[in-house]
């Protein structure tokens, strides 16, 4: 039975040209995290494997940095980066947990962070 929950940074906004940290946190489970995948829509951004470390997709090396922790930093943001991002936690023995973050990249200099929320 999957008892864990993924807490994410929720709906967030950031300025064009700036950076943003995408963060997820798995709680309420003792399952071992074996790997975390970060996706934008259906595109792989990065993998953090417990044994092998970080794999940053060669398509995104110029604009993606690993961390902090199991999170992911997006740099040099453009309006095309607006959209859904997913953290996919592969765990043993529970299985897979997925968190969703919606990022809006704004032209304006005012970019406010949304509230944190949970996805069961």
């Amino acid at each position: 039975m999957m008892t864990g929950t993924i807490e994410t940074t929720g709906n967030i906004s950031a300025e064009k040209g700036g950076s943003i940290i995408l963060q997820c946190h798995l709680s309420s489970t003792t399952a071992q995290v074996t790997q975390v995948n970060w996706e934008q829509q259906d595109q792989l951004l990065a993998i953090c494997n417990a044994d092998l470390g970080w794999h940053i997709s060669p398509s995104f090396k110029d604009r993606v940095a690993p961390g902090p922790g199991l999170g992911l930093t997006l740099q040099s943001l453009t309006v095309n980066d607006t959209g859904e991002y997913f953290c996919i936690y592969h765990t043993y023995p529970d299985g897979t947990y997925t968190g969703r973050i919606f990022l809006e990249v704004l032209e304006s200099s005012v970019a406010e962070h949304g509230a944190r929320f949970q996805i069961p």
Epitope: Q35, I47, D51, L52, G53, W54, H55, P58, D62, H90
Partner: antibody, heavy 118, light 113 residues
């Protein structure tokens, strides 16, 4: 020990398709990317594409886009490369190799010679 | 696409010689986040699959003799064989795995003088 064992040589006619297999053993198949590299006779090395069996993510060299399809069967730890609409220029040795992030391509299959001839 | 240019395309050397092969990329291969260069060197003998010698531009693969060393950063890289052995006569390729499509140099054939 880590091993990548490829299927045997193939002779195909122009316009046909070929499917080469690559059976992995000695490591966790779903942790590493499988890349496909080809080498025409007397020529250099050319990346065709890659697949991540742990998520079935794929990337293709645009040169082959639409003609090459990469798949993976996690139950048998086997990756496949299918190349369609074969032409004589596709005559080459096709290699599978594994890769993860920073560590480059550390183990290679023995290669599969595909000959395209009418 | 990142172009990889190797030189020389071939060279003749004797056992015991110091051999240097250079590789230049059309774009930097340095990933700022970890300060690593995504550049590898491979050795290939006739009829055999390539063998990984060096990754991250300068890190020797496990089991590779210490006479093989890699250096360089950004766009300019070097593979050095400090004392050529009979089994080292082969073709050497550099390869970038920084961005898609992954690309190789055209190869350097090391022949017996």
């Amino acid at each position: 020990q880590v091993q990548l064992v490829q299927s045997g040589a193939e002779v195909k006619k122009p316009g046909a398709s070929v499917k080469v297999s690559c059976k992995a053993s000695g490591y966790t198949f779903t942790n590493y990317w499988i890349l496909w590299i080809r080498q025409a006779p007397g020529q250099g090395l050319e990346w065709m594409g890659d697949i991540y069996p742990g998520g079935h993510y794929t990337n293709y060299n645009e040169k082959f886009q639409g003609r090459v399809t990469l798949t993976a069967d996690t139950s048998s730890s086997t990756a496949y490369m299918e190349l369609s609409s074969l032409r004589s220029e596709d005559t080459a040795v096709y290699y599978c190799t594994r890769y993860y992030g920073p560590y480059a391509m550390d183990y290679w299959g023995q290669g599969t010679l595909v000959t395209v001839s009418s | 696409d990142i172009q990889m240019t190797q030189s020389p395309s071939s060279l003749s050397a004797s056992v015991g010689d110091r051999v240097t092969i250079t590789c230049r990329s059309s774009q930097s291969l340095l990933y700022n986040s970890n300060q690593k260069n995504y550049l590898a060197w491979y050795q290939q003998k006739p009829g055999k699959a390539p063998k990984l010698l060096i990754y991250w531009a300068s890190t020797g693969e496990s089991g590779v003799p210490s006479r093989f060393s890699g250096s360089g950063s950004g766009t300019d890289f070097t593979l050095t064989i400090s004392s050529l052995q009979p089994e080292d006569f082969a073709t050497y390729y550099c390869q970038q795995y920084y961005s898609y499509p992954f690309t190789f140099g055209q190869g350097t054939k090391v022949e017996i003088k």
